[in-house]
């Protein structure tokens, strides 16, 4: 029951997190015009990953897309890439985790397969969250650097006669959404990995006994025992045609993913 709850909660938390990452990526307010200690302008500038916008006191908002790809700063491209990778991994993770949920029965899927899928989705959520946090942090670092650079030469002009006030940008709402969303996705991923350990069946405390038939040796696993052996493993009481007697542990040649947790 606790495993199901942990898995379900991990899924929900990750779902909220990925929705937040998508929202943050699409938001226009990654950086907003710094209004503190600045002359009050009748326009408010803010920028996203895909376009920059200007909101006037009049009520009009004008947004212009970044139609160039090569002309954009490498850092912005990197942030875009990190956010997109985060979304893609998160989306795949969600898809995998839906099938991995203990409360959903799909055919005769084994607990072992569900455990593997839970772990896979958990890892994907963790990487997705890290991508989002990294992307937002890179952008934030870029803003801080530019902020202090523009503060250093806040007023530029010809001999101090004509002054041009440089627009300084500070953290926008999207950064906070991204950080929180990335964190939630990360937490959700960790919860999925924890749930995976609970889903994995315990190793048996006894060895499978080998019975010698007159014709050839056939080792049988005890009936009703569903071993989790991962991808390409022997399950469902399959016969192992082999010369001598072996223990169950020796037969298990392909370790399952959750063995490494």
């Amino acid at each position: 029951m606790a495993v199901t709850a942990c898995q379900g909660l991990g899924f929900v938390v990750s779902l909220i997190g990925i929705a937040g990452i998508i929202a943050a990526t699409c938001m226009d307010q990654w950086s907003t015009q710094d209004l503190y200690n600045n002359p009050v302008t009748a326009v408010f500038n803010y920028q996203g990953l895909w376009r920059s916008c200007v909101r006037e006191s009049s009520g009009f908002t004008e947004c212009r897309g970044y139609f160039t790809l090569l002309g954009l700063p490498a850092m912005l491209q990197a942030v875009r890439a990190l956010m997109i990778v985060g979304i893609v991994l998160g989306a795949i993770g969600l898809l995998v985790s839906i099938f991995a949920l203990k409360c959903i029965r799909i055919g005769s899927m084994e607990d072992s397969a569900k455990a593997n899928m839970t772990l896979t989705s958990g890892i994907m959520f963790i990487v997705s969250g890290l991508c989002a946090i990294a992307g937002v942090s890179v952008f934030a670092n870029m803003l801080v650097t530019n902020f202090w650079m523009s503060t250093a030469n806040m007023y530029t002009g010809m001999g101090g006669m004509v002054q041009t006030v440089q627009t300084r940008y500070t953290f926008g709402a999207a950064l906070f959404v991204g950080w929180v969303a990335g964190g939630l996705t990360l937490i959700g991923g960790v919860m999925m990995c924890i749930a995976c350990r609970g889903l994995a069946p315990e190793e048996t405390n006894y060895k499978a006994v080998s019975y010698h038939a007159s014709g050839h040796s056939v080792a049988y696993k005890p009936g009703g025992f569903k071993a989790s052996t991962g991808f390409g493993s022997n399950t469902k009481n399959k016969k192992i045609y082999d010369g001598g007697a072996r223990t169950e542990d020796e037969v298990q040649s392909y370790p399952s993913k959750h063995d490494y947790v």
């Epitope: 015009q33 002359p39 009050v40 302008t41 009748a42 326009v43 500038n45 920028q47 920059s52 916008c53 200007v54 909101r55 006037e56 006191s57 009049s58 009520g59 009009f60 004008e62 212009r64 004509v162 002054q163 041009t164 006030v165 440089q166 627009t167």
Partner: antibody, heavy 118, light 113 residues
Framework: EVQLLESGGGLVQPGGSLRLSCAAS????????MSWVRQAPDKRLEWVAT????????FYPDSVKGRFTISRDNSKNTLYLQMNSLRAEDTAIYYC???????????WSQGLSVTVSS | DIVITQSPLSLPVTPGEPASISCKSS????????????LTWYLQKPGQPPKLLFY???TRESGVPDRFTGSGSGTDFTLKISRVEAEDVGVYYC?????????FGGGTKLEIK
């Protein structure tokens, strides 16, 4: 057609108060920023106040800050200018104007005379 | 506050002749966010409220004849009339629409010679 109709002007003593109203029609009032501009006799235009759209931000020049208050009632499509502690130099024709692209003022009222005199 | 300086103060012009009004700002009115200049031009005829001619320094308001042209960027702006007509008389104002407080130029009175 955009229409801006003012009311509330007149003669007032120094230190007195007056409330100007500007009833708007012909456009979605709540979506646009609005301003008050005045013009003293034979003088240049002087911006008095702005109520920006979306965010309830109000702006004033130092000459009227603390004495004048701009407000709006979107349900009544009306802009107001509450003028307190009036001085002789506040004597002017007061216009209300609708903000447009580039924070320009594309529609103006006909103007309302306010005279501050003892 | 931003100081807007307009010149000349008075501009007598013969009908059919061109006219030019200059407007200078103490600070740049160019917004880096959209690369637009927040300078507005108005014409005020006697006994009337001002009428919008140009916004964003060079965008002509609908209904304004194309003999009027607005130009300039940053701190220096110009309003040109290619061929002055009798109906063009009045006081022309330029306005800073970028920084609060919004400030107007002193005005240029265009009159027919």
């Amino acid at each position: 057609e955009v229409q801006l109709l003012e009311s509330g002007g007149g003669l007032v003593q120094p230190g007195g108060s007056l409330r100007l109203s500007c009833a708007a029609s012909g456009f979605t009032f709540s979506k646009f920023g609005m301003s008050w501009v005045r013009q003293a006799p034979d003088k240049r235009l002087e911006w008095v106040a702005t109520f920006s759209s979306g965010g309830d931000y109000t702006f004033y020049p130092d000459s009227v800050k603390g004495r004048f208050t701009i407000s709006r009632d979107n349900s009544k499509n009306t802009l107001y200018l509450q003028m307190n502690s009036l001085r002789a130099e506040d004597t002017a024709i007061y216009y209300c104007a609708k903000l447009y692209y580039g924070n320009s003022m594309d529609s103006w009222s006909q103007g309302l005379s306010v005279t501050v005199s003892s | 506050d931003i100081v807007i300086t307009q010149s000349p103060l008075s501009l007598p012009v013969t009908p059919g002749e061109p006219a030019s009004i200059s407007c200078k700002s103490s600070q740049s009115l160019l917004n880096s966010g959209n690369q637009r200049n927040y300078l507005t031009w108005y014409l005020q005829k006697p006994g009337q409220p001002p009428k919008l001619l140009f916004y964003w320094a060079s965008t002509r308001e609908s209904g304004v004849p194309d003999r009027f042209t607005g130009s300039g960027s940053g701190t220096d702006f110009t309003l040109k009339i290619s061929r002055v007509e009798a109906e063009d008389v009045g006081v022309y104002y330029c306005q800073n629409a970028y920084y609060y407080p919004f400030t107007f130029g002193g005005g240029t009175k265009l009159e027919i010679k």
